[in-house]
Interface confidence: medium
């Protein structure tokens, strides 16, 4: 079938398009191109006669068209008006006609856009700002970029007017950013210059520094005030409600008790019209006051920060005392006192250092105690724990994983699957899982205060088939009559039955055998040497079953009471004495001999050639098992008679 393909289909103004003819019939007389969807002589562009190889322009010919011998038509320097349908009329040698229609669309090359704004200085939490991307262009798509990123998802951001207008409701200072718009059509894309949004905000509640509120007579008082504000705030100071001066700093030299009172800093933003105040109460002491504790770090980070607790106020020739948990200070390399005892420094705080802490000032008559102070130690997160501990799941069930990590403040959690972030929750829930949900499930716990994060990765397998299990043991070499052994069948799988075999038989009934943990754990209490057998575990569900390789229990035992052989105890002079000692033991014991209490050799066999009556005495075999830590021994009396003096004597070995 005769067809027309437009290459490209979307054409930029000024470029060219090729109307490519496919399946052109054989034996042609000629062909003609027409603008539109039908053959219309008034709209003929060009005709071509094959025999003469002659091309003839028609009424719709613009001088930009070129026809090729294969009937394809090239149109150059495209204009908007060229959009639409084009019809090829083919006349075959038998004068039977055939037609085909193709089309293309023309789009303008877009100009560089710009951003207009309805509010150049919006006020935080009050104003909205509408950015509009100019100019308005037909058939164009509008995109927005914030700090060169695509728009974040936010209920305060709204696109309208075909995405040409971006409205930020209730602007905040965090909206101060670079905004760009982009226009796109099928043939071009252009991006605007940046517009920086200048959000007016504040003043926030001012901060008065230093934080110290206790002073002694004769000191200088120098207070400074700061409040976050755009544009920068103007400051005023009031003492006990009376205006003092319009400066950021307040300085009063050589203060007295009369300078005690409330000191107010007022911050004013002339553009937002807002005022904020902060009040600090300054106390000037003429005599030692009740002490109080200040800390250089109210939220120290575990294993990272040191904390200096200072007993205020500073008084010359005074004894300072400290208590932790209502006890005097323990001796610890992590606790240091300054020379005057006024500052207690905790080096590398831990979560156990919360306190409470008290300091005291000793005077002639008594000790004044401060109020207790508790430290808020930031710690963690520790390595997160993912529960439940199953690693194998069957298709079709729901996967519900929970993550927990010890942390102060409480951790924020994120879940990743195969390294890709999923959600920021403590729980991960996926319903109706399939094999495609198999993968690496990572829980990431983050402590926003310390900036630390820890991760735990769990491999989840979703399969109808169960894996080959394996046996893990809490004790690879238990000692007889002493140890217990717990065998666990791995992995832990949901909706799975666990089975056990010993030497190929099902478990015997025994008070020393106990199944627990859904039969996944087999515990042998007070193992004996007879428990040294082959143990196999099996797992099964409704569609498959599998058995582990056998694990043989290696029970350490003995040494039992040794046996000396041969049993003879009477020998003739001149015979050879050859005593062998044996004791049941695992591992094999070490042997040693003593004759009449005197240590001999460390061998299993004792050999003495040509014995005499001098060899009479007690022969002791000692056995020891280094693995069980146990020892044993046996004593045998040997009598050697002069040759021929007594019947029934052994001739020796």
């Amino acid at each position: 079938k005769l067809t027309i393909e437009s290459t490209p289909f979307n054409v930029a103004e000024g470029k060219e398009v090729l109307l490519l003819v496919h399946n052109l019939p054989q034996h042609l007389f000629g062909y003609s191109w027409y603008k539109g969807e039908r053959v219309d002589g008034n709209r003929q562009i060009i005709g071509y006669v094959i025999g003469t190889q002659q091309a003839t322009p028609g009424p719709a010919y613009s001088g930009r068209e070129i026809i090729y011998p294969n009937a394809s038509l090239l149109i150059q320097n495209i204009i908007q008006n060229d959009t639409g349908f084009y019809t090829l009329h083919v006349i075959k040698s038998d004068l039977v006609n055939e037609e085909a229609t193709g089309q293309f669309r023309v789009y303008p090359e877009l100009p560089k856009p710009s951003i207009s704004s309805n509010n150049s200085k919006p006020v935080e939490d009050k104003d909205a700002v509408a950015f509009t991307c100019e100019p308005e262009t037909q058939d164009a798509t509008y995109l927005w970029w914030v700090n060169n990123q695509s728009l974040p998802v936010s209920p305060r951001l709204q696109l309208s007017n075909g995405n040409r207008t971006l409205t930020l409701f209730n602007v905040t200072r965090n909206d101060t950013a670079s905004y760009k718009c982009e226009t796109q059509n099928p043939v071009s894309a252009r991006r605007s210059d940046s517009v920086i949004l200048n959000v007016l905000y504040g003043p926030d509640a001012p901060t008065i520094s230093p934080l110290n509120t206790s002073y002694r007579s004769g000191e200088n008082l120098n207070l400074s005030c700061h409040a976050a504000s755009n544009p920068p705030a103007q400051y005023s100071w009031f003492v006990n409600g009376t205006f003092q001066q319009s400066t950021q700093e307040l300085f009063i030299p050589n203060i007295t008790v009369n300078n005690s009172g409330s000191y107010t800093c007022q911050a004013h933003n002339s553009d937002t019209g807002l005022n904020r105040t902060t009040v600090t109460t300054i106390t000037v002491y003429a005599e030692p006051p009740k002490p109080f504790i200040t800390s250089n770090n109210s939220n120290p980070v575990e294993d990272e920060d040191a904390v200096a607790l200072t007993c205020e106020p500073e008084i010359q020739n005074t004894t300072y005392l400290w208590w932790v948990n209502n006890q005097s200070l323990p001796v610890s390399p992590r606790l240091q006192l300054s020379n005057d005892n006024r500052t207690l420094t905790l080096l590398s705080v831990t979560r156990n250092d919360v306190g409470p802490y008290e300091c005291g000032i000793q005077n002639e008559l008594s000790v004044d105690h401060s109020d207790p102070v508790i430290l808020n130690v930031l710690y963690g997160p520790d390595d997160p724990t993912i529960s439940p501990s199953y690693t194998y799941y069957r298709p079709g069930v729901n996967l519900s994983l929970s993550c927990h990590a010890a942390s102060n403040p409480p951790a924020q959690y994120s879940w990743l699957i195969d390294g890709n972030i999923q959600q920021h929750t403590q729980e991960l829930f996926i319903s109706n899982i399939t094999e495609k949900n198999s993968g690496l499930y990572t829980c990431q716990a983050n402590n926003s205060a310390s900036g630390h994060s820890r991760t735990t990765v769990k491999t989840i397998t979703v399969s109808a088939e169960l894996p080959k299990p394996s046996i893990s043991s809490n004790n690879s070499k238990p000692v007889e009559d002493k140890d217990a052994v717990a065998f666990t069948c791995e992995p832990e799988a949901q909706n799975t039955t666990y089975l056990w075999w010993v030497n190929g038989q099902s478990l015997p009934v025994s008070p020393r055998l106990q199944l627990s943990n859904g039969n996944r754990t087999l515990t042998l209490f007070n193992v004996t040497r007879n428990d040294a057998r082959a143990y196999v575990c099996g797992i099964q569900n409704s569609v498959s079953a599998n058995r582990s390789d056998p694990v043989t229990l290696d029970v350490l035992y003995g040494p039992d009471t040794p046996i000396i052989s041969p049993p003879d105890s009477s020998y003739l002079s001149g015979a050879n004495l050859n005593l062998s000692c044996h004791s049941a033991s695992n591992p094999s014991p070490q042997y040693s001999w003593r004759i009449n209490g005197i240590p001999q050799q460390h061998t299993q066999v004792l050999f003495i050639a040509k014995i005499t009556p001098n060899n009479n005495g007690t022969y002791a075999c000692f056995v020891s098992n280094l693995a069980t830590g146990r020892n044993n021994s046996i004593v045998k009396s040997i009598t050697v008679s002069a040759s021929g003096t007594s019947p029934g004597l052994s001739a020796g070995a």
């Epitope: 195969d418 495609k436 690496l440 990765v457 989840i460 397998t461 088939e465």
Partner: antibody, heavy 124, light 110 residues
Framework: QVQLQESGPGLVRPSQTLSLTCTVS????????MHWVRQPPGRGLEWIGW????????EYAPKFQGRVTMLVDTSKNQFSLRLSSVTAADTAVYYC?????????????????WGQGSLVTVSS | DIQMTQSPSSLSASVGDRVTITCRAS??????????MHWYQQTPGKAPKLLIY???NLQSGVPSRFSGSGSGTDYTFTISSLQPEDIATYYC????????FGQGTKLQIT
Amino acid sequence: QVQLQESGPGLVRPSQTLSLTCTVSGFNIKDYYMHWVRQPPGRGLEWIGWIDPENGDTEYAPKFQGRVTMLVDTSKNQFSLRLSSVTAADTAVYYCNTRGLSTMITTRWFFDVWGQGSLVTVSS
Amino acid sequence: DIQMTQSPSSLSASVGDRVTITCRASKSVSASGYSYMHWYQQTPGKAPKLLIYLASNLQSGVPSRFSGSGSGTDYTFTISSLQPEDIATYYCQHSRELPTFGQGTKLQIT
């Protein structure tokens, strides 16, 4: 029998879009993540990305981000790769593949079933 | 991205030799008891073929002379007794995050 078969033009002009289709037989495409990997002449293997035919989710290697699109037609058991604005550096054998059909293993990202590969040359 | 460094890039050995290829990842590719490292063989003009998955598991139908080991960042692929049909390029690949391949080791027989 499990098979993957790549098809598409062997020659693409610079700046144009490379398009390849992978036809799957012997299993249901929806059950597995489907991947594209390429190998420039005389060079090593480069992973391009995956598509989950069940829902159309995709993930691409950072190198190809912005140029690559993967689509799926589950009715035909086919998935496709489109790589735009190609240059001579995109000349390569392109393989479609999938992971562990015969192994009960948890990672979606090793490949024991491969197509035979389709050589695409980028040249004017 | 985790980068893979495979060495050597090429090697020659005789029939019957023991051949070892190593692959090092820029960070650990082990997690929760698995090592996400795999090995492929590619003969000229053919698609790669999976030999070893998860560091040490032999893919079904692959001869037992091929083996793999390792954990964390360092992995080894071994051919215990080289055969003439083992002439190929071998690639490691991790799947701990988005997958990347090693640059390949071309094995020739002397």
